[in-house]
């Protein structure tokens, strides 16, 4: 029967007693980096292709014994994942070895530097199709790791690493915190994160996505027909590949952030118990589990949007948080979440041509989020419209006055330490969906956009008082653009999107014992591109 | 024994070319900066990855590394130039001892200078 | 009117241990980040480490890291700063800070400690 | 040597305008906030300036900010004698996770 890992990845349309899905990815070129592999392995004969190189460092110890089965057990089994016949993911992916980790699994930085180096001097020797990179490594945060694989990545090439099977902040490894690089962390069969000994997967806002890592049945380098069943980030990353390549096989044109967002978008939502996080990683960590897309073709039609945190800003109120999309993303919207409520809003600005997301840190120490929302919006023309506060009126507002935008988002970011004891709160006026409402002594940040067919509205869910959390969710065929709150005041820690619902978290008045009146309500602005709807039936 | 000989070939070259005029005065501006594994084990003290600024050309990367060798020798150092990057990252990695760091950092193009350190399966 | 009081500087060898204290008042210390900043005799400015107001984050240089801790007992109004394996570079004023770089900033009078053999 | 590069000495006469400079990178002044702070002979640092250009109650509208880029500037105008200090700037660097300070600036009256 069809391997537990197989299985999870593969829509129910697919589903077989065989894993067969449509074309294996014949179009895609896999590089591994790693150790040295039994390339005449049954799973993975004349599908992989062992380049000459090696850049590894000695093994550790002095009566160290190189045994072949050992020294190609971790990349024979990758590629197994990656490309075998019976247990593979994407069966029709070609693949080339590098080896730059030794018997012992161990590499350095510079000798995976230099294996990036040769990948891009052979894409620019003789062009193929697209290319993955599958780095099942990790190591302390490195710089120059991260620019490299930034590089490569700016060059058209997909790199899928491993999290890291520390139980620790992937942002705290590399090549798992280099933003360009598709980051996996590894579940198990139950869609518990994997526990690996003492340790397991990492977690958190460097990881995008989760895939199966726990006794995957792949290649074993004991003999030529064996099987072994290994657990780790790295067999993750390899499944993740394995569909990139499936992906790319089928539409070779994707780019890396289109690749990214279909990703996340056909993942498995919300599968994953939480609770094996430590509770500050919790809402950072994305509950995502990769899938195969239920058909090939016929995604275009959807805007794609992703969640990115920023990294926290640090305790002083000096420290600002950033949340970046990625360059062909848009910034549709941004957000800002502070688990102690001590915040100042947040907005969105220009920086070096671009649309950033900033969040201000107020008193205490505690430090505040930025979090973007990331869209693919195809020849959008999107600009943010502010409105500095009001002052005496009853609220600050701000719309959206060009002819043909929309607004896909609301920020507002305020001086005063605390909105809470500034009243009155804002009561949002209805039937007026292109405008953005807020506190009187707060500025207001417009995101207004212009895209062939882009249509959007607002969507609002309020409870009397502050409950510890209010949601609103897009309904099917719409993807939310934007999330915020109303009123912006200290009982509201901030909002957030979760896939297409919009998260607003408070301080429960429970637990603080106030006797507020205010209701807080969760602001949705959801989207739909007709244009695009058109342009995938005019195709089919 | 090959490789100190190796060693002092490229000793003996880098002296001439610094004679020969090859490198050029250091720039003055923003200093570069160091970065080291915060994981203490995992680091690898003795090579170091110099990484230039984006728009250093193959041939300015290996002028600056034969002036960090140069330099160096006059100081009673011996280095080794592993490998000259191109293609991805401008820049070079070098074995050398880290009392030279302060002076490498000086170096004209040079954007950060990074310890090398251990990767590992996962 | 805030007041930052700081204590226990003195001398002390290379390699050992001393703790600081800051005892705070005129506010509602539990609200604030406070931090410790150094200034080396003749020198600059040094951050040495913050922590937030209900104590649960803490950040520190990286000349301190693994060498002092710093922590807070709110319902004594006091900051503290152990120091260990101290070293003669961190000869010292000492000022206790609360919320660096935001309206609400404010600096004891320092204690000045010295590491010397 | 300080992340953040500020000139040694400035002077200048009374009544005259004095303007003293940090220039720091994108992991600091470029992405958050700068302080600046006074510093009188024998006493505890005095905050000056906060969020680039915000004047705390009781400081004189002497006294200013002002950011660009990765620089900031705080300019004395109307210089007394009792402005003679240590000037330092400060701010918070992302990618140190720390607080970091200029090297001082020795502001002499003349």
């Known amino acids: 029967s069809i391997p537990w890992n197989l299985e999870r990845i593969t829509p129910p349309r697919y589903r077989a007693d065989e894993y067969q899905p449509p074309d294996g990815g014949s179009l895609v070129e896999v590089y591994l980096l790693d150790t040295s592999i039994q390339s005449d392995h049954r799973e993975i004969e004349g599908r992989v292709m062992v380049t000459d190189f090696e850049n590894v460092p000695e093994e550790d110890g002095t009566r160290f014994h190189r045994q072949a089965s050992k020294c190609d057990s971790h990349g024979t089994h990758l590629a197994g994942v990656v490309s075998g016949r019976d247990a593979g993911v994407a069966k029709g992916a070609s693949m080339r070895s590098l080896r730059v980790l030794n018997c012992q699994g161990k590499g350095t930085v510079s000798g995976t530097l230099i294996g990036l180096e040769f990948i891009r001097k052979s894409q620019l020797v003789q062009p193929v199709g697209p290319l993955v990179v599958l780095l099942p490594l990790a190591g302390g945060y490195s710089r120059v790791l991260n620019a490299a694989c930034q590089r490569l990545a700016r060059a058209g090439v997909v790199l899928v690493t491993a999290a890291g099977n520390f139980r620790d902040d992937a942002c705290l490894y590399s090549p798992a915190s280099a933003p360009e690089v598709i980051t996996v962390g590894a579940t198990n069969a139950q869609d518990q994160p994997v526990t690996l000994g003492t340790l397991g997967t990492n977690f958190g806002r460097c990881v995008d996505l989760f895939a199966p890592g726990e006794d995957i049945i792949g290649a074993s380098s004991d003999c030529s027909t064996c099987f072994v069943s290994q657990s780790g980030t790295s067999q993750a990353a390899a499944h993740v590949a394995g569909i990139a390549a499936m992906m790319l096989s089928a539409e070779p044109e994707l780019t890396l952030a289109e690749l990214r967002q279909r990703l996340i978008h056909f993942s498995a939502k919300d599968v994953i118990n939480e609770a094996w996080f430590p509770e500050d990683q919790r809402v950072l960590t994305p509950n995502l589990v990769a899938a195969l897309p239920p058909s090939t073709h016929g995604a275009g039609w959807q805007l794609f949007c992703r969640t990115v945190w920023s990294a926290h800003s640090g305790p002083t109120r000096m420290a600002t948080a950033i949340a970046r999309c990625a360059p062909d993303e848009e910034l549709l919207s941004c957000s800002s979440f502070s688990r102690s409520g001590k915040r100042r809003g947040e907005r969105m600005e220009a920086q070096g041509g671009k649309l950033v997301c900033r969040a201000h840190n107020a008193f205490g120490g505690e430090g505040v989020y930025a979090i973007a929302r990331c869209c693919l919006l195809p020849q959008a023309n999107c600009s943010v419209h502010t409105a500095p506060p009001a002052e005496a009126s009853m609220g600050t507002r701000v719309h959206c006055h060009q002819q043909g935008h929309v607004l896909t988002g609301c920020s507002s970011h305020w001086e005063v330490e605390d909105l809470g004891t500034h009243k009155p709160p804002v009561l949002r006026p209805r039937g007026q969906p292109n405008q953005c409402v807020g506190h009187r002594e707060a500025s207001i940040h417009a995101s207004c956009c212009h895209a062939p067919g882009l249509e959007c509205k607002v969507k609002e869910h309020g409870i009397p008082a502050p409950q510890g959390q209010v949601t609103v969710a897009c309904e099917e065929g719409w993807t939310l653009t934007g999330c915020s709150a109303l009123p912006g005041t200290s009982h509201v820690l901030g909002a957030y999107a979760v896939d297409n619902t919009c998260v607003v978290r408070s301080r429960d008045v429970s637990t603080t014992g106030s006797t507020s009146e205010e209701a807080v309500t969760a602001v949705a602005i959801c989207c739909r591109s007709r244009h695009l709807a058109q342009a995938s039936q005019e195709l089919q | 024994q090959e490789d100190e000989d190796g060693d002092y070939e490229e000793l003996v070259l880098a002296l001439r070319s610094e004679e020969d005029g090859l490198a050029e005065a250091p720039e003055h501006g923003t200093t570069a900066t160091f970065h080291r594994c915060a994981k203490d084990p995992w680091r690898l003290p003795g090579t170091y990855v110099v990484v230039l600024k984006e728009e250093t050309h193959l041939s300015q990367s290996e002028r600056t590394a034969r002036r960090l060798q140069a330099q160096a020798a006059r100081r009673g150092y011996l280095t080794k130039i592993l490998h000259v990057f191109h293609g991805l990252l401008p820049g070079f990695l070098v074995k050398m001892s880290g009392d030279l760091l302060e002076l490498a950092l000086k170096l004209p193009h040079v954007d950060y200078i990074e310890e090398d350190s251990s990767v590992f399966a996962q | 009117e805030v007041q930052l009081l700081e204590s226990g500087g003195g001398l002390v060898q290379p390699g050992g241990s001393l703790r600081l204290s800051c005892a705070a008042s005129?506010?509602?210390?539990?609200?604030?980040?406070m931090s410790w900043v150094r200034q080396a005799p003749g020198k600059g400015l040094e951050w040495v480490s913050t922590i937030s107001g209900s104590g649960g984050r803490t950040y520190y240089a990286d000349s301190v890291k693994g060498r002092f801790t710093i922590s807070r007992d709110n319902s004594k109004n006091t900051l503290y700063l152990q120091m260990n394996s101290l070293r003669a570079e961190d000869t010292a004023v000492y000022y206790c800070?609360?919320?660096?770089?935001?309206?609400?900033?404010?600096w004891g009078q320092g204690t000045l400690v010295t590491v010397s053999s | 040597q300080s992340v953040l590069t500020q000139p040694p000495s400035v002077s200048a006469a009374p009544g005259q305008k004095v303007t003293i400079s940090c220039s720091g990178s994108?992991?600091?002044?470029?992405?958050?906030?700068v302080s600046w702070y006074q510093q009188l002979p024998g006493t505890a640092p005095k905050l000056l300036i906060y969020?680039?250009?915000k004047r705390p109650s009781g400081i004189p509208d002497r006294f200013s900010g002002s950011n660009s880029g990765t620089s900031a500037t705080l300019g004395i105008t109307g210089l007394q004698t009792g402005d003679e200090a240590d000037y330092y700037c400060g701010t918070w660097d992302s990618s140190l996770s720390a607080v970091v300070f200029g090297g001082g600036t020795k502001l002499t009256v003349l």
């Open positions: 969020d680039n250009n």
């Open positions: 005129g506010f509602t210390f539990s609200s604030y980040a």
């Open positions: 800070a609360k919320e660096v770089g935001s309206p609400f900033d404010y």
């Open positions: 994108n992991s600091n002044i470029g992405n958050n906030y």
